[in-house]
């Protein structure tokens, strides 16, 4: 078990130009706090996975009002450390958010509003008991000076908070075997509780005869590097030679995740999703409320009136989650109508819509026909976003302008000639023909074979086509 | 909107036992705790049982006018609450409602039990 | 166990303010017992007006607000109306146990 600690040395417009409007002014006094965000491993920083070594907010700084025309200064810090207890080993190698937020002091209807001005992210290796480590990190225009270290609480010390130390029983010398606690000199090694054999360097124990493994660490004495990468199954221990995950405890069994918290196993180790007002590696951590500000990306903070849901976040547009810390695809929903091509921008949605719709989701057909004529008596069909116009017989293209050649195709069959005629065309068919289009031919007997004539007409009179 | 019906009161003798259900559409009933809560003829309004959601292993509280005699329980599959009743009292006589706690309160339009020799 | 106080019966004119209050015998209220105001009206009619201390219910009226007033919860109605009156009751959450208040008349004349 342990502390980290972030010291916030600075907050203020970086290096070079653009520098940022100062974020409170005469007319809406605010101030600063701070929430950092810890995560084991390499993790990546997320802002929507758990934090599941743990999270801390500051307390409030003073109030601050910009003096009109001056450039934004650094910015009064809130007084204190940011401290995140961890119960467990600390890992060694940790990822980190820490967002500045700006509490808004002026007449706000139900109470002070908050914004995030800026989050800044890393993934750091660090040894606990070491000394302060300094960061600098840029967000936009803002800069962020800190600095932060890991220590152990007694009676845990070592580089991940695992070897338990305690005040010699004899003045001179620890016990046989145990080794003084460095740099707690007149402090000795406690006597081994762990399972025999346990890793000193990669198993950790909480309970006399258990070992427990570091992260990237197996086997029943934490002895085996993981290595997933010729395994067929996800759990865990199996020989010390390959590194093999094969089927044993999975990390979830008991299920360590506690308030409710649900456990789902990750490659290496396992993760807790929290019910709401729960965090920490284990859900152990509880009693958030509003007034810690538990609320990402500027969701607005309410009561709750039961305990298990102690607060409620109103996310806004783009977010979601109990705490609006998942940002919504809101693309994956299909906002756009008829085939639109959907942008995220973050702060809205736009649809670029294809030829022929437009509106915000593409939702409005346009009239193709709008304002388009076609011509010589051709009539406006709208169709699928675009038009088209049916001409008149003896016209074509895309208006109707063209006049046509209805002979060019060649419609009269067996020989026929074909004439152009006012209102279409007319074959003259070749004898032993007859028909609109020649199709038909005239049995020697004088007969069709199909239709009949029609009345008032001989076979191989020319016959025009309506 | 959230809708609460409850159903299952009626007239029951003493030492007798009684079923009450309550229905829950238009929210998503796994994730919250439900209670019951009821109000005895002319009087104010007293919390009877309380179960959590499948997060917290579905754990049970009582007031304990009613523990041992009480059962509360949930079927998140159907979205319905219920609370059985046994060795049932004079006292117990109350419109029962169905109370889901989240922003605020909801409650059902209640169902009467009548516990009566 | 907690017993949770109010006052038994008010009486306020129309476009006055009043307030009601809730005491916990177990120490000062909190924003950790989700203070929650019902109100009833004739017929067994309950409405949830606030929840967690200060939450105002939709579609209830703004003149109907929330708070933790020294170390009670209390009620305000800011400009009272004479449909306003009811009986309002507060419960108090104690970790899982609610305890409910007697409730408040409140006559609007």
């Known amino acids: 078990a342990g502390v980290f600690e972030l010291q916030i040395h600075s907050f203020g417009p970086g290096p070079g130009p653009g520098a940022p409007r100062s974020p409170c002014s005469a007319r809406l006094p605010c101030r600063l706090f701070f929430r950092v965000c810890l995560k084991p491993g390499l993790s990546e920083e997320a802002a929507e996975s758990p934090c599941a070594l743990g999270a801390a907010l500051s307390a409030r700084g003073p109030v601050y009002t910009e003096q009109p025309g001056a450039p934004a200064p650094d910015l009064p810090l809130p007084d204190g450390l940011l401290q995140v207890p961890f119960r467990d080993a600390w890992p060694g190698t940790f990822s980190f958010i820490i967002e500045t937020w700006r509490e808004e002091l002026g007449d706000q209807i139900g109470g002070p509003a908050w914004s995030l001005l800026a989050r800044v992210a890393g993934r750091r290796r660090l040894a606990a008991g070491g000394p302060w480590a300094r960061d600098i990190q840029r967000a936009g225009a803002w800069e962020l000076r800190f600095s932060y270290r890991a220590r152990c609480e007694p009676p845990a010390v070592g580089t991940a908070c695992t070897r338990l130390c305690r005040p010699r029983s004899a003045p001179s010398r620890c016990g046989p075997g145990l080794r003084p606690c460095a740099p707690l000199e007149d402090e000795c090694e406690a006597p081994l509780v762990c399972r025999a054999g346990c890793s000193p360097e990669h198993g950790f124990c909480e309970q006399p005869g258990e070992c427990r493994c570091l992260e990237g660490w197996t086997g029943p004495l934490c002895t085996v590097p993981v290595s997933t990468s010729s395994c067929l199954s996800p759990r865990g221990p199996s020989s010390a030679t390959t590194g093999c995950l094969v089927p044993g405890p999975g990390p979830c069994d008991g299920n360590p995740c506690a308030n409710g918290g649900s456990c789902s196993e990750t490659p290496r180790s396992f993760e807790c999703t929290c019910p709401r007002g729960f965090y920490g590696l284990r859900c152990e951590v509880s009693g958030v409320t509003c007034a810690d500000g538990p609320c990402f990306n500027g969701g607005l903070c309410v009561g709750g009136a039961d305990p298990d849901s102690a607060y409620i976040c109103h996310c806004p547009p783009g977010f979601q989650g109990s705490n609006c810390e998942k940002r919504v695809d809101r693309c994956s929903l299909q906002p756009c109508r008829n085939g639109g091509l959907c942008l995220d921008l973050g702060h809205a949605l736009r649809c670029r819509c294809r030829a022929g719709f437009a509106g915000p989701r593409c939702e409005h057909d346009l009239d193709d026909c709008a304002g388009r004529a076609c011509a010589n008596g051709g009539t406006c069909v709208e169709g699928g976003g675009a038009h088209r116009c049916s001409c008149a017989l003896g016209f074509g293209g895309r208006d109707c302008r063209e006049r046509a050649d209805p002979c060019a195709a060649r419609p009269c069959a067996h020989g026929g000639r074909c004439y152009a005629h006012f209102s279409g065309l007319v074959c003259a068919c070749a004898p032993g023909y007859m028909g609109a289009r020649c199709e038909f031919p005239v049995h020697p007997d004088g007969a069709s074979a199909l239709p009949a004539a029609p009345p008032g007409l001989r076979p191989g009179d020319p016959q025009r086509y309506l | 909107e959230v809708q609460l019906v409850e159903t299952g009161g009626g007239l029951v003798q003493p030492k007798g036992s009684l079923k009450l259900s309550c229905a829950v559409s238009?929210?998503?009933?796994?994730?919250?705790?439900m209670n019951w809560v009821r109000q005895a003829p002319g009087k104010g309004l007293e919390w009877v049982a309380r179960?959590?959601?499948?997060?917290?292993?579905?754990?049970?509280y009582y007031a304990d006018s009613v523990k041992d005699r009480f059962t509360i329980s949930r079927d998140d599959s159907q979205s319905m609450l219920y609370l059985q009743m046994n060795n049932l009292k004079i006292e117990d006589t109350a419109m029962y409602y169905c109370?889901?706690?989240?922003?605020?309160?909801?409650w059902g339009q209640g169902t009467l039990v009548t516990v009566s020799a | 166990q907690a017993v949770v106080t109010q006052e038994s019966a008010l009486t306020t004119s129309p476009g006055e303010t009043v307030t009601l209050t809730c005491r916990s015998s177990?120490?000062?209220?909190?924003?950790?017992?989700?203070a929650n105001w019902i109100q009833e009206k004739p017929d067994h009619l309950f409405t949830g007006l606030i929840g967690?201390?200060?939450n105002r219910a939709p579609g209830v009226p703004a003149r109907f607000s929330g708070s933790l007033i020294g170390d009670k919860a209390a009620l305000t109605i800011t400009g009272a109306q004479t449909e306003d009156e009811a009986i309002y009751f507060c419960?108090?959450?104690?970790?899982?146990?609610?305890?409910f208040g007697g409730g408040t008349k409140l006559t609007v004349l």
């Open positions: 179960i959590r959601n499948h997060s917290n292993n579905y754990a049970t």
């Open positions: 177990t120490g000062a209220v909190t924003t950790s017992n989700h």
């Open positions: 967690g201390t200060n």
């Open positions: 419960g108090l959450w104690y970790s899982n146990h609610l305890v």
């Open positions: 238009a929210f998503t009933f796994t994730t919250y705790a």
């Open positions: 109370v889901f706690y989240y922003d605020y309160v909801y």
